[in-house]
């Protein structure tokens, strides 16, 4: 009688993570008597995957009833496949021995490859805000995919970026892989509403790439421009001075009025107006009683924006001239800032 052969008809099997893998194996004879076992890998370090008589293998089921006397089909199904299950599986026939059964013949092996989707890309920006014209770095990470081939692209407001570096780890063979990419983005004053997008394409995604986003509003700081102007006279001895704080982001802002270097009033930006580009404008004004001053008054608008060093703009108020003759710039609306008389 011809010697028993163990036949594994599939050289390779490709399965998506989460699905069930079927590993086929048949024997050509019932003799010698002894069990079939399945292993992953070969040699002394091989891993037992299934033993039909002993051991706990909750993910494995047999395709046919191995207790049937004439059964020669030893195919198995492995459920809930993960990338860690990738490898070469061997169907091995044992013959009865004492004390232990003895390996008799092995199949040629079936290579199980697992396709696993990448995790949703996570985009993270710099820890601290940066101002326009500065270059900032964004990172994008995605994990757990297999096979290794993957494509990553960066976009800013739909426009593809070219200044980035990408690594896929590990370099050698692995059950699954991770991708890490760093992109450099130059900020502009108009970027408050901008988005940076990391897009990952992989064979498991069937042409529908995964995207991770970061809003530049979390990254950018647009410093304000200041303009101090003197408004037309309200009364014979009063001058209205305004400080226009324009095009700033984020909103966190504190303004201090100084009269000849002495703090007159401090307020926090509240009722701001938003510009189309996402930046804010705000105005504060002071009502100055010039009759209380013998000398010229230096009024300073000092602004501390988002915890940064203060910036200021000054205006010299000539007391000697009649208030009505003072030069004035554009009229400003009353934004509801508190009036403050200086006596």
């Amino acid at each position: 009688e011809e010697e028993l052969q163990v036949i594994q008809p599939d050289k390779s099997v490709l399965v998506a993570a989460g699905e069930t893998a079927t590993l086929r194996c048949t024997a050509t004879s019932l003799i010698p008597v002894g069990p079939i076992q399945w292993f992953r890998g070969a040699g002394p370090g091989r891993e037992l995957i299934y033993n039909q008589k002993e051991g706990h293998f909750p993910r494995v089921t047999t395709v046919s009833d191995l207790t049937k006397r004439n059964n020669m089909d030893f195919s198995i199904r492995i459920g809930n496949i993960t990338p860690a299950d990738a490898g070469t599986y061997y169907c091995v026939k044992f013959r009865k021995g004492s004390p232990d059964d003895v390996e008799f013949k092995s199949g040629a092996g079936t290579e199980l490859s697992v396709r696993a989707k990448p995790s949703a890309p996570v985009v993270s920006g710099p820890a601290a805000r940066a101002t326009p014209q500065h270059t900032v770095s964004f990172t994008c990470e995605s994990h757990g995919f297999s096979p290794r081939d993957i494509t990553l692209k960066w976009f800013k407001n739909g426009n593809e970026l070219s200044d980035f570096q990408t690594n896929v780890d590990p370099v050698g063979e692995s059950v699954s892989y991770s991708i890490h990419s760093t992109a450099k983005v130059v900020l502009t004053r108009e970027d408050v509403h901008s988005q940076v997008i990391c897009e990952v394409a992989h064979v498991t995604l069937q042409g529908d790439p995964l995207r991770g986003t970061a809003n530049l509003s979390e990254t950018i700081r647009v410093p304000p421009t200041l303009e101090v102007t003197q408004q037309p006279v309200r009364a014979e001895n009063q001058v209205n001075v305004t400080c226009q704080v324009r095009k700033f982001y984020p909103q966190r802002l504190q303004l201090t009025w100084l009269e000849n270097g002495n703090v007159s009033r401090t307020e926090t930006a509240s009722t701001v107006t938003e510009n189309k580009d996402g930046t804010y404008n705000w105005m504060s004004w002071l009502l100055v009683n010039v009759s209380a001053h013998r000398d010229d008054v230096k009024l300073t608008c000092q602004v501390e924006h988002d915890g940064q060093p203060a910036v200021s703009k000054s205006h010299d108020l000539k007391v000697s001239a009649h208030p009505k003759e003072q030069g004035s710039n554009t009229a400003a609306e009353n934004t509801g800032s508190n009036e403050r008389n200086i006596y």
Partner: antibody, heavy 114, light 108 residues
Framework: QVQLVQSGAEVKKPGASVKVSCKAS????????MHWVRQAPGQGLEWMGR????????KYNPKFQDRVTITVDTSTNTAYMELSSLRSEDTAVYYC???????WGQGTTVTVSS | EIVLTQSPGTLSLSPGERATLSCRAS???????LYWYQQKPGQAPRLLIY???NLASGIPDRFSGSGSGTDFTLTISRLEPEDFAVYYC?????????FGGGTKVEIK
């Protein structure tokens, strides 16, 4: 659900034999081995042997080789363990265990006393 | 036969503490064949971990197993009151099948 129901407690005299039964239900009895494990009072677990119900093939712990016999009756899905020439140190709880090591019988207390 | 030596024999710990139980084999055991059980007084052993590191069904993930060759470890990350019991390692790599002598985890 899977169940292994063992026979009741036994009290035996030294030199006698005891036969403990284990009735299986909820699974294909011939699928896996059936093992027998014992535990003396306050002691650890000791493997005695196993049987392949499909073929009647047995393996025994050399310590018990001459005194233990494991058999099955596939018509009733029952495994048996017989221990002969009992001595006081055979006083123990005897468990039948399915080949997957998940399912254990409730245990049978065998007391050997003169 | 493969002799499994468990240490310590008794481990006295408080709830919330980490327990590390050792099982050393007299000769190499393939990790697929090393199992751990938990046994409480008057009960049959319960399979805890199979193939060195896989949790059996219904076992909380505070239990974990590791090791290879001749050295294996069962770890309980944070002891709960119901974890105080006796733990056994077991090999079925070769005949005769053997169990370790057990480690009793008791309340300090």
């Amino acid at each position: 659900q899977v169940q292994l129901v063992q026979s009741g407690a036994e009290v035996k005299k030294p030199g006698a034999s005891v036969k403990v039964s284990c009735k299986a239900s909820g699974f294909n009895f011939e699928d896996t081995y059936m093992h027998w494990v014992r535990q003396a009072p306050g002691q650890g677990l000791e493997w005695m042997g196993r049987i392949d119900p499909a073929e009647g093939d047995t393996k025994y712990n050399p310590k018990f080789q001459d005194r233990v016999t494991i058999t099955v009756d596939t018509s009733t899905n029952t495994a048996y363990m017989e221990l002969s020439s009992l001595r006081s140190e055979d006083t123990a709880v005897y468990y039948c265990v399915r080949g997957n090591y998940v399912n254990w019988g409730q245990g049978t207390t065998v007391t050997v006393s003169s | 036969e493969i002799v499994l030596t468990q240490s310590p024999g008794t481990l006295s710990l408080s709830p919330g503490e980490r327990a590390t139980l050792s099982c050393r084999a007299s000769s190499s055991v393939s990790s697929s064949y090393l199992y751990w059980y938990q046994q409480k007084p008057g009960q049959a052993p319960r399979l805890l971990i199979y193939s060195t590191s896989n949790l059996a069904s219904g076992i909380p993930d505070r239990f974990s197993g590791s090791g290879s060759g001749t050295d294996f470890t069962l770890t309980i990350s944070r002891l709960e009151p119901e974890d105080f019991a006796v733990y056994y390692c077991h090999q079925w790599y070769s005949y005769p099948r053997t169990f370790g002598g057990g480690t009793k985890v008791e309340i300090k």
